[in-house]
C-alpha cells in the first residue's frame, strides 16, 4: 500500500477507522511543461530496434487510452537496413498506475491498479547458450 | 479530464454539484501476474544504448520511489565494446500518473499528477543537418 507520513494535523493512519479509500482530485496537474515537446515522437522509427504503437482502449480505466509498443523485429536493424539476428530487439516495460472504475461504469469511484506496459524497444546482446 | 460513461445507477456527471474529487480505493490490484518475470531486468546493461537507473524519491507522491533512466553514452555501443558516435543513445520517455498529497503531508487526500519519466534508452540514427 501507500506509506503514510505522520502529521499531527491529519487523522492518525494507524486508527482502525482510517479509510482505505482516499479522495483524489481529478484536475490533473501536469509537471511536463519544460520538456521537449518532440520527446520520443519519432524514435520508434529511427531506432535500431524499431517498434509499432498499438492503441489499447478501455473506457473503464483512466487513462482510457494507453499506447503499447511492439518491437517490429526479433533482431536489430543495421545501418544498411538489414535485420541483424546476432542482436535482439526487446520491449522496455514499465509498471504504471491507472484508475479502474469500481463499481464498473460508475464515474466517481475508482480503484488503483498497476499494469505493465511496453513503452518502446531497445537492442540487446543475446545471452547465447551453446549445446555442449 | 476523465471521460465519464453514462449509467443510470450512478450520479449524473453533468450535475453542477458532481464532484471533481472522486473516491479511490488504495488496495492496489496488480494485473501483472502472467507477465514474464525476467522483464526488462538486465536490459539496461545488455543494450547497445545502456542506461543507469537513478532513484527519485518523494514522500509526498505515490509511488514515492520512481526509477529514472539516464543513458550512459551519447553514442551507441558496438559489438567490440567501443562507442559509435554515428548513432545516438536516447531516452524513451513516458507520461505516467502519480498521486500527489494535497494538502501536503495529509494521507487521505491526493491530486492526480502527470509526470514524464525516462524508462530506458534506445539507439537511433541521428538526424543529420548538413550545412548548405
Amino acid at each position: 500500500g501507500i506509506a503514510i507520513p505522520r502529521n499531527s494535523g491529519c487523522p492518525n493512519s494507524e486508527d482502525k477507522n482510517f479509510p482505505r479509500t482516499v479522495m483524489v482530485n481529478l484536475n490533473i496537474h501536469n509537471r511536463n511543461t519544460s520538456t521537449n515537446p518532440k520527446r520520443s515522437s519519432d524514435y520508434y522509427n529511427r531506432s535500431t530496434s524499431p517498434w509499432n504503437l498499438h492503441r489499447n482502449e478501455d473506457p473503464e480505466r483512466y487513462p482510457s487510452v494507453i499506447w503499447e509498443a511492439k518491437c517490429r523485429h526479433l533482431g536489430c536493424v543495421k545501418a544498411d537496413g538489414n535485420v541483424d539476428y546476432h542482436m535482439n530487439s526487446v520491449p522496455i516495460q514499465q509498471e504504471i498506475l491507472v484508475l479502474r472504475r469500481e463499481p464498473r461504469h460508475c464515474p466517481n469511484s475508482f480503484r488503483l491498479e498497476k499494469i505493465l506496459v511496453s513503452v518502446g524497444c531497445t537492442c540487446v546482446t543475446p545471452i547465447v547458450h551453446h549445446v555442449a | 479530464g476523465i471521460a465519464i460513461p453514462r449509467n443510470s445507477g450512478c450520479p449524473n456527471s453533468e450535475d453542477k454539484n458532481f464532484p471533481r474529487t472522486v473516491m479511490v480505493n488504495l488496495n492496489i490490484h496488480n494485473r501483472n501476474t502472467s507477465t514474464n518475470p525476467k522483464r526488462s531486468s538486465d536490459y539496461y546493461n545488455r543494450s547497445t544504448s545502456p542506461w543507469n537507473l537513478h532513484r527519485n524519491e518523494d514522500p509526498e507522491r505515490y509511488p514515492s520511489v520512481i526509477w529514472e533512466a539516464k543513458c550512459r553514452h551519447l553514442g551507441c555501443v558496438k559489438a567490440d565494446g567501443n562507442v559509435d558516435y554515428h548513432m545516438n543513445s536516447v531516452p524513451i520517455q513516458q507520461e505516467i500518473l502519480v498521486l500527489r498529497r494535497e494538502p501536503r503531508h495529509c494521507p487521505n487526500s491526493f491530486r492526480l499528477e502527470k509526470i514524464l519519466v525516462s524508462v530506458g534508452c534506445t539507439c537511433v540514427t541521428p538526424i543529420v543537418h548538413h550545412v548548405a
Epitope: 509499432n52 539476428y85 535482439n88 526487446v90 520491449p91 543475446p126 547458450h129 551453446h130 | 545488455r46
Partner: antibody
Framework: QVQVQESGPGLVKPSETLSLTCTVS?????????WNWIRQPPGKGLEWMGY???????SYNPSLKSRITISVDTSKNQFSLKLSSVTAADTAVYYC?????????????WGQGTLVTVSS | IIVMTQSPLSLPVTLGQPASISCRSS???????????LHWYQQRPGQSPRLLIY???NRFSGVPDRFSGSGSGTDFTLKISRVEAEDVGVYFC????????FGQGTRLEIK
C-alpha cells in the same frame, strides 16, 4: 483468404540473374507481415533465402547475401526476388511465403512453388 | 547460423499408432524477450509446406488436435497421437529466433 503466387521463367542460364515475382491477394502487403522467399532443391530440404517486411526492412541468408535482392512494389501488391550469378546449385522449387511478423514469426501461407532450372 | 538436427530421418508408423519426431538446435532458441520461436511444418507429397505448430506448442488454425509440440531451450518434439493416412509426408522443424533455418526433414510413412 490469403493467396501468394510465384511467377517467372522456369529456365535460367548459368551466370545470369534469376528473377521471380510473387503476387499477394487477399492481404495488403503493407500490413504486419514479412514476405519470404524459401527454396527447396529437388529431393532436398528447405532453405530460407530472405524476406522483406511491411516496413521495407530486409533480411538475407548470409550464404546468399552478396547475390540476393528482395524488393516490394506496394502499388501492385507484389514482391520480387533477384538472385545473380546463378549456378546449377540454384536449381530448386522457389516458394514465396507470408510470415506473420507481429507475434509468432512463422510462415503461415505458402505459394504452390515454381521450379527454376539453371542450365545452359 | 543455427543448425537444426532432426531424428529420425525416416519414420515408418502403423496407422492409429503414435509417432514422435525430435528436433535439436545448436544454440538455445529462447529469444531475449522470453519467447521461443520454434515451429513445425508438414509437407505432403507434391504439396507446399504447411504450418502445424508455432512457438513450440501452439497449434495453427485448422490443425487437428492429434498434433502436439513440446520442448524448450534446444530440444523439441512433435508428437502425433494417432497417425492417419493423410499424415504421410515430410515434417520440418524451423526456428526464427536467429537467422531462420530448417531441419533436414523427417519422412513419415505408413508401415
Amino acid at each position: 483468404q490469403v493467396q501468394v503466387q510465384e511467377s517467372g521463367p522456369g529456365l535460367v542460364k548459368p551466370s545470369e540473374t534469376l528473377s521471380l515475382t510473387c503476387t499477394v491477394s487477399g492481404n495488403s502487403i503493407t500490413s504486419y507481415y514479412a514476405w519470404n522467399w524459401i527454396r527447396q532443391p529437388p529431393g532436398k530440404g528447405l532453405e530460407w533465402m530472405g524476406y522483406i517486411t511491411y516496413s521495407g526492412t530486409t533480411s538475407y541468408n548470409p550464404s546468399l547475401k552478396s547475390r540476393i535482392t528482395i524488393s516490394v512494389d506496394t502499388s501492385k501488391n507484389q514482391f520480387s526476388l533477384k538472385l545473380s550469378s546463378v549456378t546449377a546449385a540454384d536449381t530448386a522449387v522457389y516458394y514465396c511465403a507470408r510470415e506473420e511478423y507481429d507475434d509468432i514469426y512463422a510462415v503461415d501461407y505458402w505459394g504452390q512453388g515454381t521450379l527454376v532450372t539453371v542450365s545452359s | 547460423i543455427i543448425v537444426m538436427t532432426q531424428s529420425p530421418l525416416s519414420l515408418p508408423v502403423t496407422l492409429g499408432q503414435p509417432a514422435s519426431i525430435s528436433c535439436r538446435s545448436s544454440q538455445s532458441l529462447v529469444h531475449s524477450n522470453g519467447n521461443t520461436y520454434l515451429h513445425w511444418y508438414q509437407q505432403r507429397p507434391g504439396q507446399s509446406p504447411r504450418l502445424l505448430i508455432y512457438k513450440v506448442y501452439n497449434r495453427f488454425s485448422g490443425v487437428p488436435d492429434r498434433f502436439s509440440g513440446s520442448g524448450s531451450g534446444t530440444d523439441f518434439t512433435l508428437k502425433i497421437s494417432r497417425v492417419e493416412a493423410e499424415d504421410v509426408g515430410v515434417y520440418f522443424c524451423s526456428q526464427s529466433t536467429h537467422f531462420p533455418t530448417f531441419g533436414q526433414g523427417t519422412r513419415l510413412e505408413i508401415k
